[in-house]
Amino acid sequence: MAPWPELGDAQPNPDKYLEGAAGQQPTAPDKSKETNKTDNTEAPVTKIELLPSYSTATLIDEPTEVDDPWNLPTLQDSGIKWSERDTKGKILCFFQGIGRLILLLGFLYFFVCSLDILSSAFQLVGGKMAGQFFSNSSIMSNPLLGLVIGVLVTVLVQSSSTSTSIVVSMVSSSLLTVRAAIPIIMGANIGTSITNTIVALMQVGDRSEFRRAFAGATVHDFFNWLSVLVLLPVEVATHYLEIITQLIVESFHFKNGEDAPDLLKVITKPFTKLIVQLDKKVISQIAMNDEKAKNKSLVKIWCKTFTNKTQINVTVPSTANCTSPSLCWTDGIQNWTMKNVTYKENIAKCQHIFVNFHLPDLAVGTILLILSLLVLCGCLIMIVKILGSVLKGQVATVIKKTINTDFPFPFAWLTGYLAILVGAGMTFIVQSSSVFTSALTPLIGIGVITIERAYPLTLGSNIGTTTTAILAALASPGNALRSSLQIALCHFFFNISGILLWYPIPFTRLPIRMAKGLGNISAKYRWFAVFYLIIFFFLIPLTVFGLSLAGWRVLVGVGVPVVFIIILVLCLRLLQSRCPRVLPKKLQNWNFLPLWMRSLKPWDAVVSKFTGCFQMRCCCCCRVCCRACCLLCDCPKCCRCSKCCEDLEEAQEGQDVPVKAPETFDNITISREAQGEVPASDSKTECTAL
């Protein structure tokens, strides 16, 4: 792939977008104080004005934009002011507000439920395969294999808690050492960040919104990848996580605690268990090489069972196989012994949709995967719509100020750390980092939360999920307590180490810059978002997995040249932007490479051809399909429901520019009308102030 997606002849033009430069956008004059960010991540050196004419930080020829695309949109209130309303209007407005709140909570509820069902669907589709990944004996000796197994398994089961609980059970039954488990935990941390990235894809309809949402989601990915990139070699060399956690576990005499409180599950379980119920023990059993488990279904059929322990007579090949000498006898031909057996009697069937269908796991999983994604997408669209109509004018100003404004000097630096605590606390309450970060994504998209603020919230979420794991570990039975606690602590200290690496010093907040860069690319070439998802969460881990299975010689033989090329490109890129004069003329830009190696334009043409849209028509039957279609064919504008958009962007033909961002419109609703997304509504009836 290209070192940077677009590397043409560079012209220092501060009014143009930088397509790939990790979020280094020209700074626009501040329109409103509320978008001011104190914890600015950008280093002064990288400002566009300072780039020499021969720099390779290419600027795309686009119409001049006054605004920084990363500035939050101004959500203006076009409705009648509260003071100007009559009593009837006020009452109507009040009930409208209550109605919206109820709708918002309802959609939020189904959004969280669909995430839960999405996880179940993934487990049904890939859970058994995930379990088999764990039964690979090379994990013990190859930390890289452990890492990718952690990623793949968590992506396949859509739940880091499932993959970590498998690891815990494997460690406590001595199938895995804590040392071998640490890379898997790191991988699980990466894998869990796919959920909010998938959620971000649902906001593909609006380029500006998508840019922010996708960047906000991938900041989690980049944090995890970068942390692993640095901390895995450190761990392999020093075993610091293993040593620290071992010391902690050994220095405390832990008593078995109580289970971590299931706060959100209490509300969502009654609904999700009506859809499907899974027997998660099956995945663990497969991971622990239980042959019988391979033929078991993950779909739970019996919910009420009676377990009776009894002793039965069984034949054994010889007296040596007897349970004990005193429990050994013969009938003259065969040797017999007495075995304790647990007899399971099925009493009552589970009450869920798939209980009587007897469909294969793959079929149930596929059905649920499609349905949950549709519900997820639908809920997300509705949440964004409701929030868009509620968060306007004063309400928006108050919320944005509260969330995005820093503490007064000299305590500004504390704001981010408070956000980390809030993220951790919220994740602890909802018991899932995926749920928290997925709920955060649309808020970043519509511009309520800045990426700079979302970043510490996400980091906090990473911490929150580990505190849940620590509590769950303390509730483990005696034999699993030590191992589960040590693994939970490894997870905790890994995230703490990551935060220390990529948060305290603004300059080191690389994940923000990288996420912004990816947001820019994905807003321009929306198919790249899917491409990124497949590459980072499937292809790279699967390639490493395959190479690891082929042996370490093959892994090193392929890996070393690849790593060398990446380092070479990064060094060259750094020299091009910082001190190009030291480079030969030819290497001062990327023009020496063929276009397909330095730009996404040719790839865009290929993708467009493959999807059959040719960027001219984008047919759809419903809003959800429309969004999916827009994502695949990169249709410039999202079509109206039940209609086709045929070359809606004639005015912009030949120009690779983002659709006019909603911030230039009075409010989101109006902006969407202009983009042909929603039917026009009488703005006078809008009620925003509660």
Partner: antibody, heavy 120, light 107 residues
């Protein structure tokens, strides 16, 4: 009721073989193990071996291995024991017996016995 | 092979007396022990299996006990029809082995 009827007494010369039968009735022949036990005059009981008629599986006392052959004919519900290379110490009453107490070697039904006299 | 040592080899007692016959196994046989009664000129008859379980039709004056290596058969109140030779048997290991027998007579 369960009945085990054994063949009549035999007088054989040393070195010869003897084959005795045990005809059963009153139960399903293939269900239970058939044991063969002998008792020398004025002596204790000695287990020779057993056969499971259902599969033909056999088990022998190491002392008799190579000299004894146990067989079963399912069609006639009859068990057979053949003892070769007879010696004078093989003179005894030979009993066939079954164990209806599943999985145990405790035999609860016995035949009347076949007296084998080894004499030159 | 497991050797079953039975004692006494014979005993003479009166009707109504309590009779105790012991059997010692050369190694642990758990509870896989049976007791047989053989009257002169007859085939043996199963009295007790699994050390203490009476076979159907066996009077309750016959009681078995023990485990491991030491086993006992008790005839609580000797009756004239109990005159016979009593054998213990282990079925813990192949080959099945019997005790040498205890001859019970009435004075």
């Amino acid at each position: 009721q369960v009945q085990l009827v054994q063949s009549g007494a035999e007088v054989v010369k040393p070195g010869a073989s003897v084959k005795m039968s045990c005809k059963t009735s009153g139960y399903t022949f293939i269900t239970y193990n058939m044991h063969w036990v002998r008792q020398a005059p004025g002596q204790g009981l000695e287990w020779i071996g057993a056969i499971y008629p259902g599969s033909g599986d056999t088990s022998y006392n190491q002392k008799f291995k190579g000299r004894v052959t146990l067989t079963a004919d399912k069609s006639t519900s009859t068990a057979y024991m053949e003892l070769s290379s007879l010696r004078s110490e093989d003179t005894a009453v030979y009993y066939c017996s079954i164990s209806t107490i599943i999985t145990t070697g405790a035999v609860d039904y016995w035949g009347q016995g076949t007296l084998v006299t080894v004499s030159s | 092979d497991i050797v079953m040592t039975q004692s006494p080899s014979s005993l003479s007692t009166s009707v109504g007396d309590r009779v105790t016959i012991t059997c010692k196994a050369s190694q642990d046989v758990g509870t896989a022990v049976a007791w047989y009664q053989q009257k002169p000129g007859q085939s043996p008859k199963l009295l007790i299996y699994w050390t203490s379980t009476r076979h159907t039709g066996v009077p309750d004056r016959f009681t078995g006990s023990g485990s491991g290596t030491d086993f006992t058969l008790i005839i609580r109140s000797l009756q004239p029809e109990d005159v016979a030779t009593y054998f213990c048997q282990q079925y813990s290991r192949i080959p099945l082995t019997f005790g040498s027998g205890t001859k019970v007579e009435i004075k």
